[in-house]
Interface confidence: medium
Amino acid sequence: QERRFQLEGPESLTVQEGLCVLVPCRLPTTLPASYYGYGYWFLEGADVPVATNDPDEEVQEETRGRFHLLWDPRRKNCSLSIRDARRRDNAAYFFRLKSKWMKYGYTSSKLSVRVMALTHRPNISIPGTLESGHPSNLTCSVPWVCEQGTPPIFSWMSAAPTSLGPRTTQSSVLTITPRPQDHSTNLTCQVTFPGAGVTMERTIQLNVSYAPQKVAISIFQGNSAAFKILQNTSSLPVLEGQALRLLCDADGNPPAHLSWFQGFPALNATPISNTGVLELPQVGSAEEGDFTCRAQHPLGSLQISLSLFVHWKPEGRAGGV
């Protein structure tokens, strides 16, 4: 003989795959205080319970260890805890109270659990700026994961030099010591929920601050093709009166500030150009000598110089005697 009772609260609950949900259940108020029995949660249409506190009763293999009856008859609690929710948990469930000593049991109304695809993705947090050569701690977190679920597995993927730091149920720390070449490369945190067999990931692009490593000068002489110098040059022959365009280029992140100086500048020298471009419309005696491009950056500066040697036109020389 069965007595029916209505589960209080919702008729359906939603949970994301791999996460947890609590199916609320309160024992009927009409239940005698002396009623002694066991509680069983069943999948609609099944004979074997998904969870019970009856030590002699088997539970379904599929739900063993993931479904738990939270049994507290004094507080009238018969809730069902589901962790590591799986796609096939998407079903209707009901609770049954049975006693070997009483002639009647209680059966609840059903409640549907709806398991949706996991859409939450891990968060990657970076404290401040990533600086070349300096270790930084990156944290991959899944704050929406429930504590009672099977702890997720964290995997990191990066080309930069890294080492694993501490981890909790909901987060993993990665220590990264980036190099200039790691700027704009990908870093991925992958989180796998072994209880449900679901994997989620997030990828970010590293923004690494670094001082200029390379500085170069491209030289445009009249109509002739440009050529590039990558190191200090002792002497560059130029024809008198020729137009010359010097283009300075440096790496570094954020971009270095480029400026041109005549001679070998002191730290506080005044530049002759505040950009990376130096235009010399007519090379003459005033332009003979050294020109320096300085790439200034908060993390360090770099400079490159070239020396102009002016070839005089023969007729120009004769006219000057």
């Epitope: 609260g9 919702p10 008729e11 359906s12 609950l13 939603t14 994301q16 796609r87 998407n90 209707a92 549907s112 709806r114 398991v115 949706m116 695809a117 859409t119 939450h120 929406w144």
Partner: antibody, heavy 120, light 107 residues
């Protein structure tokens, strides 16, 4: 292309019943719950209930139990909502909306709405 | 039933601005919140679900955030076509309930 085509506007007398249809196309009908939502004039949205077309299982908002009955005809991929004992309070636009019950989204496609007017 | 409260019935903004529409649940809904846009004479359109997941084809100027009981829909770089009613909805437990709606007006 996913489409939910609802039946046309209805003018009904108080006390009567009406059956609104929602014909689905462009997807597997039994793979999605069909939900029904009420929107009274100038008001917000109210969830009436849903039906799992695969097994005909329904869940209702307590407020609409006894008022609405949800059914499906799998052969024609059509969902129905019957409203009975109509009163002026039932005058509203009624929408059907699908929900992938294992899937990535909520009410991702909606019907165009059916306007029900209850007047003597 | 879970009550979803959208405290602002109307919000006014200008094209290019950023606007945040808020929604409060009467209990923890574990990020099971969706946002819909409804333009005059049209059916609602899904924008965001599970608090922050953008639905397919929704422009990335629409962003959802929140957890527990407090949720926000942010529209950055507001466009003239964003003039609409915006509803939040909890999909944690039945009956699924909607907020009262926030009407976004363009100055």
């Amino acid at each position: 292309e996913v489409q939910l085509q609802q039946s046309g506007p209805e003018l009904m007398k108080p006390g009567a019943s009406v059956k609104i249809s929602c014909k689905a196309s462009g997807y597997t009908f039994t793979d999605y719950y069909m939900n029904w939502v009420k929107q009274s004039h100038g008001k917000s949205l109210e969830w009436i209930g849903d039906i799992n077309p695969k097994i005909g299982d329904t869940i209702y908002n307590q407020k609409f139990k006894g008022k609405a009955t949800l059914t499906v005809d799998k052969s024609s991929s059509t969902a129905y909502m019957e409203l009975r004992s109509l009163t002026s309070e039932d005058s509203a636009v009624y929408y059907c909306a699908r929900w992938d019950y294992y899937g990535s989204s909520l009410f991702d496609y909606w019907g165009q709405g059916t306007t029900l007017t209850v007047s003597s | 039933d879970i009550v979803m409260t959208q405290s602002h019935k109307f919000m006014s903004t200008s094209v290019g601005d950023r606007v945040s529409i808020t929604c409060k649940a009467s209990q923890d809904v574990t990020t099971a919140v969706a946002w819909y846009q409804q333009k005059p004479g049209q059916s609602p359109k899904l924008l965001i679900y599970w608090a922050s997941t953008r639905h397919t084809g929704v422009p990335d100027r629409f962003t959802g955030t929140g957890s527990g009981t407090d949720y926000t829909l942010t529209i950055s770089n507001v466009q003239a076509e964003d003039l609409a009613l915006y509803y939040c909805q909890q999909h944690y437990s039945t009956p699924y309930t909607f907020g009262g709606g926030t009407k976004l007006e363009i100055k």
